[in-house]
Interface confidence: medium
């Protein structure tokens, strides 16, 4: 059964999905789709990564975490009731039938209506407003093969040097996580 996540209309929704790349420069393609994960690929793809980049996205959908360290959690900006439903995060591990598939259920609740306060107070939005003028991913020509391996010393150095990403333990525990390599 799907893990359920909730957001209110007008907020940003966050759907966690993680994996651990064998090395920071050796990514596994990931796709996000609207609808349960099919046998292959993702249906109704909203975002896709390849071995190096986010190479396709649609308006309002983006990865705010450090996807090159395996945080491929999906952010949906300014959700509406129509965004409710099942979403598929698919870690496309090379090999036949090796993919890891995670179905996440998003439930959108109507925005809370609160009585007007008797005096005005400062209000800070919980989510910053993002520009979403893009409707599709970048146009590029690619031929991609296996990407670089990094030795253990480099991985250790990278782990020490790179900024802590959003792969916090509590998020990792609440989302889909898979170890690659």
């Amino acid at each position: 059964s799907e893990v359920e996540y909730r957001a209110e209309v007008g907020q940003n929704a966050y759907l966690p999905c993680f994996y651990t790349p064998a090395a920071p420069g050796n990514l596994v393609p990931v796709c996000w789709g609207k609808g349960a994960c099919p046998v292959f690929e993702c249906g109704n793809v909203v975002l896709r990564t390849d071995e190096r980049d986010v190479n396709y996205w649609t308006s309002r959908y983006w990865l705010n975490g450090d996807f090159r360290k395996g945080d491929v959690s999906l952010t949906i900006e300014n959700v509406t009731l129509a965004d409710s439903g099942i979403y598929c995060c698919r870690i496309q591990i090379p090999g036949i039938m090796n993919d890891e598939k995670f179905n996440l259920k998003l439930v959108i609740k109507p925005a809370k209506v609160t009585p007007a306060p008797t005096r005005q107070r400062d209000f800070t939005a919980a989510f910053p407003r993002m520009l979403t003028t893009r409707g599709h991913g970048p146009a590029e020509t690619q031929t991609l093969g296996s990407l670089p391996d990094i030795n253990l010393t480099q991985i250790s150095t990278l782990a020490n040097e790179l900024r802590d990403s959003r792969l916090a333990n509590d998020l990792r525990d609440s989302g889909a996580t898979i170890r690659i390599g």
Epitope: P24, G25, R52, D53, V54, N55, W57, W62, L63, N64, G65, D66, F67, R68, T75, M130, L131, T132, T133, R134, G137, P138, E140, T141, Q142, T143, L144, G145, S146, L147, P148, D149, I150, Q154, T157, L158, E161, L162, R163, S165
Partner: antibody
């Protein structure tokens, strides 16, 4: 120490091709991406594409699709960028830049630049 | 393509003063932003990677911050050798794009 040494300045006529080389030393050439970036006179930086020397995988900026080709010679640790059908607005300094040690996607070492002038 | 817009285009600041250069992406790029310094006649030099990580050997007066669409390069106390053009770059998705540059001068 890491060094990227590029070939010398070139003067070409419109419609011609240019091939710029970038010889790498001081690190394992096949372990890092090599990107190419150009800078027109008095202008900003523009990304042309990258090549991963280990397997020859490339990605090109769509703007240059069909005109640019990136190759490597692993035996000499040299990367090449060829730009064809040159136009006057291709006049620029062309840089090779190594994808970084801490981040493969930003450039920690740059070549000294190769000035390409396209003029009739 | 993702457009990176820097502000201001140029600025003049007194030695020892704090400098702030902003960069805005046309869509969210997470933390996939680098900052470069380019002095006249030289190749660019990496200052900051992944938005906030100072590259090896870069003086600690340089710092980067931001995530999503808004990024900032800060020089806490301007030195004479910091006169240069500064560029932000997104590497979230290719084609990787740079800001138009910010020229920093001494007042």
């Amino acid at each position: 120490q890491v060094q990227l040494v590029q070939s010398g300045a070139e003067v070409k006529k419109p419609g011609a091709s240019v091939k710029v080389s970038c010889k790498a030393s001081g690190y394992t050439f096949t372990d890092y991406y090599m990107d190419w970036v150009r800078q027109a006179p008095g202008q900003g930086l523009e990304w042309l594409g990258y090549i991963y020397p280990n397997n020859g995988g490339t990605s090109y900026n769509q703007k240059f699709k069909g005109r640019v080709t990136m190759t490597t010679d692993k035996s000499t640790s040299t990367a090449y960028m060829e730009l064809r059908s040159l136009r006057s607005d291709d006049t620029a300094v062309y840089y090779c830049a190594r994808g970084g040690y801490y981040s493969y996607y930003s450039y920690d070492y740059w070549g000294q630049g190769t000035t390409v002038t396209v003029s009739s | 393509d993702i457009v990176m817009t820097q502000s201001p285009d140029s600025l003049a600041v007194s030695l020892g003063e704090r400098v702030t250069i902003n960069c805005k992406a046309s869509q969210s790029v997470g933390n996939n932003v680098a900052w470069y310094q380019q002095k006249p006649g030289q190749s660019p030099k990496l200052l900051i990677y992944y938005a906030s990580n100072r590259y090896t050997g870069v003086p600690d007066r340089f710092s980067g911050s931001g995530s999503g669409t808004d990024f900032t390069l800060t020089i806490s106390s301007l030195q004479a050798e910091d006169v240069a053009v500064y560029y932000c770059q997104q590497h979230y998705s290719s084609p990787y794009t740079f800001g138009q540059g910010t020229k920093l001068e001494i007042k």
